[in-house]
């Protein structure tokens, strides 16, 4: 239950608090996923030197990872709630194939990788509920996703490490932008 305004006492009987609003629930869920990404990034950085690679070097990749742009209406200037919500949901749906790719990429954080994937599905569901009347949301083609997954898994070890790092970094940035935008809604 959410904390009531001004309440910070230690031992209280259950107050008749309000249930979490849709926005509060989404906010908590994004933070949950971000904490998972941090754990996965930690393992990736310990395992390879990708985290030290320059942004320029990492940018030389052919991954089509979702990214927020000015036209998406999620930034403070030109903010548009409906356009932005569509972008967030569409972006998360596009990230799903990359999160599937991550599933076999971790040893000690295998459960976290699964939790991030599952929680993203839950987040999409929470957001779709918020965007009930928006019909501009396109779902990626399963066949396209399947061939992309096969292609990513066929890369050599160095490229797989690079891909893992890029997915985590991009997903973190996308979620952080989404969190900021959603707090304005």
């Amino acid at each position: 239950a959410p904390v009531l305004p001004g309440e910070d006492s230690k031992d209280v009987a259950a107050p008749h608090s309000q249930p979490l609003t849709s926005s509060e629930r989404i906010d908590k869920h994004i933070r949950y996923i971000l904490d998972g990404i941090s754990a996965l990034r930690k393992e990736t950085c310990n395992r390879s030197n990708m985290c030290e690679s320059s942004k320029e070097a990492l940018a030389e990749n052919n991954l089509n990872l979702p990214k927020m742009a000015e036209k998406d209406g999620c930034f403070q200037s030109g903010f548009n709630e409906d356009t932005c919500l569509v972008k967030i949901i569409t972006g998360l749906l596009e990230f799903e194939v990359y999160l599937e790719y991550l599933q076999n990429r971790f040893e000690s954080s295998e459960e976290q990788a699964r939790a991030v994937q599952m929680s993203t599905k839950v987040l999409i569901q929470f957001l779709q509920k918020k965007a009930k009347n928006l019909d501009a949301i396109t779902t990626p083609e399963p066949t396209t996703n399947a061939s992309l997954l096969t292609k990513l898994q066929a890369q050599n070890q160095w490229l797989q490490d690079m891909t893992t790092h890029l997915i985590l970094r991009s997903f973190k940035e996308f979620l952080q932008s989404s969190l900021r935008a959603l707090r304005q809604m």
Epitope: V3, L4, E7, P19, Y32, I33, Q112, K129
Partner: antibody, heavy 115, light 107 residues
């Protein structure tokens, strides 16, 4: 490893104390958490919950004043300190993520209060 | 506190049957209701939240409906793995309260 793992259960005499732990993965650091219990062969009962910072705790009336929920975010661990235990506190105790509904649960730890 | 009453408390059915479990709240709780499935010796698993939203990866044969005081969990075609105990929970106000459970057994 599982995301939530409870420990600390066991046999304790009436009037005694016990501290349960719930080791959580890092994902739960910014989450409200709850303890839920289940007496043998009975239904589920919410015990109480705690805010992410640990600054606010909420309890069911039947444990208020006897049980204390706390957390140590540096250790990713949630605690349930149980004092003045009674026979009716005998149950499997679960920790769970609290989004008002509980979407992730530990496997539970059994607490038996008996002389 | 809000009381949650589930019916029936136990139910025998066969694979392929359509099954309905009901949950009644002692006062209006809007759609703040969740359904869980629990198997012996295991933790509960969330099936439905907000009255009718299926949690991801829960099979589509499970559906929830209702608002206010009366709620229903329906399993459209029972599968062998569905034999378990089902609980409803209100989160309209704390203390959160659960129904007493419905044990679904094989006929």
């Amino acid at each position: 490893y599982p995301q939530l793992v409870e420990s600390g259960g066991g046999l304790v005499q009436p009037g005694g104390s016990l501290r349960l732990s719930c080791e959580a993965s890092v994902l739960f650091k910014h989450q409200d958490m709850s303890w839920v219990r289940q007496a043998p062969g009975k239904g589920l009962e919410w015990v109480g919950s705690i805010s992410p910072s640990g600054g606010s705790t909420y309890y069911n009336d039947n444990v208020l004043g006897r049980f204390t929920i706390s957390r140590d975010n540096s250790k990713n661990t949630l605690y349930l300190q149980m004092n003045s235990l009674r026979a009716e506190d005998t149950a499997v105790y679960y920790c769970a993520r609290d989004l008002d509904f509980m979407d992730e649960w530990g496997q539970g730890t059994l607490v038996t209060v008996s002389s | 506190d809000i009381q949650m009453t589930q019916s029936p408390s136990s139910l025998s059915a066969s694979v392929g049957d359509r099954v309905t479990i009901t949950c009644r709240a002692s006062q209006g709780i809007s759609n703040y209701l969740a359904w869980y499935q629990q198997k012996p010796g295991k933790a509960p698993k969330l099936l439905i939240y907000d009255g009718d939203d299926r949690y991801p990866e829960v099979p589509s044969r499970f559906s929830g409906s209702g608002s206010g005081t009366d709620f229903t969990l329906t399993i459209s075609s029972l599968q062998p793995e569905d034999f378990a105990t089902y609980y409803c929970q209100q989160y309209y106000s704390t203390p959160y309260t659960f129904g007493q459970g419905t044990k679904l057994e094989i006929k």
